[in-house]
């Protein structure tokens, strides 16, 4: 049994997340994950899910009753999702920590927008013509 | 020229994001994007970047001076990043809108944690033995 299972069960007790009513009104993450089979689509969704859990864990990091469980689960996420690659985890953390209300951050984000957009579609690297085929869109003549 | 370029230039004016000092203290997104060549790694990072821009645009959605620019850029992101797939965009939006401080959301998230974790590593779908080869880790005997 993977180590996170025991620790997740401990968190379930702490949050009363084993109660039958928890399943009411559908799932948060599981149904969404079932919709996406392509690895790159799954990464788009899992990226948001992992950042949610990291925020959740941050809010409870000083609670001694679940500290060990939280740390074990975070370590397991780092091994599995980030492949133990600290640079990947660090870059991810930087992105999740930017404040959208900070005017300097806003200005930088807008300053970088054109270049970010240019790289958004999967084949952005391999030329405009190829890229337009990737997302199957062509611009109408102006 | 892609349509977002003109609109991004308009946003730059609005945010004074063309000023030379904007480049001080490095980039928010561009250096991070340069670190990652693998498509799945890029999607992990771009997922956070896109959610940042969507939050930013939401904060300025009622400002008439940039409304058209914001809507054009959002449409372009939907075409390029979500491949014009509304279900993908909708699932993404759901994930970004969950409140980490809502106790019902917390309980659901913890309830689903074991299954989310089981799918985190790329080969999760194809059995434990194969997965352990993906991150090349085996569990020590307890």
């Amino acid at each position: 049994q993977d180590p996170y299972v025991k620790e997740a069960e401990n968190l379930k007790k702490y949050f009363n997340a084993g109660d039958p009513d928890v399943a009411d009104n559908g799932t948060l993450f599981l149904d969404i994950l079932r919709n996406w089979k392509e690895e790159s689509d799954r990464k788009i969704m899992q990226s948001q899910i992992v950042s949610f859990y990291f925020k959740l864990f941050k809010n409870f990091k000083d609670d001694q009753r679940i500290q060990k469980s939280v740390e074990t689960i975070k370590e397991d996420i780092n091994v599995k999702f980030f492949n133990s690659n600290k640079k990947k985890r660090d870059d991810f953390e930087k992105l999740t920590n930017y404040s959208v209300t900070d005017s300097n951050v806003q200005r930088k984000a807008v300053h970088e927008l054109i270049q970010v957009m240019a790289e958004l579609s999967p084949a952005a690297k391999i030329g405009k013509r190829k890229r337009s085929q990737m997302f199957r869109g062509r611009r109408a003549s102006q | 020229q892609d349509p977002y370029v003109k609109e991004a230039e308009n946003l730059k004016k609005y945010f004074n994001a063309g000023d030379p000092d904007v480049a001080d203290n490095g980039t928010l997104f561009l250096d991070i994007l340069r670190n990652w060549k693998e498509e799945s790694d890029r999607k992990i990072m771009q997922s956070q970047i896109v959610s940042f821009y969507f939050k930013l645009f939401k904060n300025f959605k009622d400002d008439q001076r940039i409304q058209k620019s914001v809507e054009t850029i959002k449409e372009d992101i939907n075409v390029k990043f979500f491949n014009s797939n509304k279900k993908k965009r909708d699932d993404f939006e759901k994930l970004t809108n969950y409140s980490v401080t809502d106790s019902n959301v917390q309980r659901k998230a913890v309830h689903e944690l074991i299954q989310v974790m089981a799918e985190l590593s790329p080969a999760a779908k194809i059995g434990k033995r194969k997965r352990s080869q993906m991150f090349r880790g085996r569990r020590a005997s307890q």
Partner: antibody, heavy 124, light 111 residues
Framework: EVQLVESGGGLVKPGDSLTVSCVAS????????IHWVRQAPGKGLEWVAT????????FYSDSLRGRFTVSRDNANNSVYLHMSSLRGEDTALYYC?????????????????WGRGTLVTVSS | NFMLTQPHSVSESPGKTITISCTRG????????VQWYQQRPGGVPKIVVF?????PSGVPDRISGSIDTSTNSASLTISGLQTEDEADYYC??????????FGGGTKLTVL
Amino acid sequence: EVQLVESGGGLVKPGDSLTVSCVASGFTFSNYFIHWVRQAPGKGLEWVATISGRTKYMFYSDSLRGRFTVSRDNANNSVYLHMSSLRGEDTALYYCVRGYDHSDSNSAADLLHWGRGTLVTVSS
Amino acid sequence: NFMLTQPHSVSESPGKTITISCTRGRGYIASYYVQWYQQRPGGVPKIVVFEDTQRPSGVPDRISGSIDTSTNSASLTISGLQTEDEADYYCQSYDDANHVIFGGGTKLTVL
């Protein structure tokens, strides 16, 4: 003060088995990955194996997989490297090295703290 | 393979500056942190640069690390060379499974 102390090295014959140990102090042991790195006489550094902290996942050099097994006992701040079917080319100084705390985004550097090593000699 | 290639040896006079390169054979240099270790004769390896460019406390600012994505390599630069800098220097990074990998080492001689 962070300390890692290896023991258990010695002279063994080809084909024999040997377990080297490492005892750590000065930090919360279970939080950190631990690496084994070896250095043959007059040669460079070679990574052997890694074991994660709380989750105890094991990672091995492809060239050694199957012959070497890493394990840890967090209660006793100890990590072990069991080596079987030893060969002459396994003769080396074996270092125990502290890795990252992968639950802490502000973790100290990987491979920051090294033990002094324990010498394993494989010879008939 | 994922080998990190370093020059076998470099030598320079005291006071001068040397740069030791570490070229990644496969995979992208910027996707994994690079560390540098100094090992004096008979001593234990000691980290002098971690996470590409960071220096641990106690390491002089004469020593610096950098990454060059155009050559897919990392570099260790030591300025104002001193006799005590004479040692073997190893770069270290990770393969695509995030296994630790080391360069072959560079022997630095201060003439």
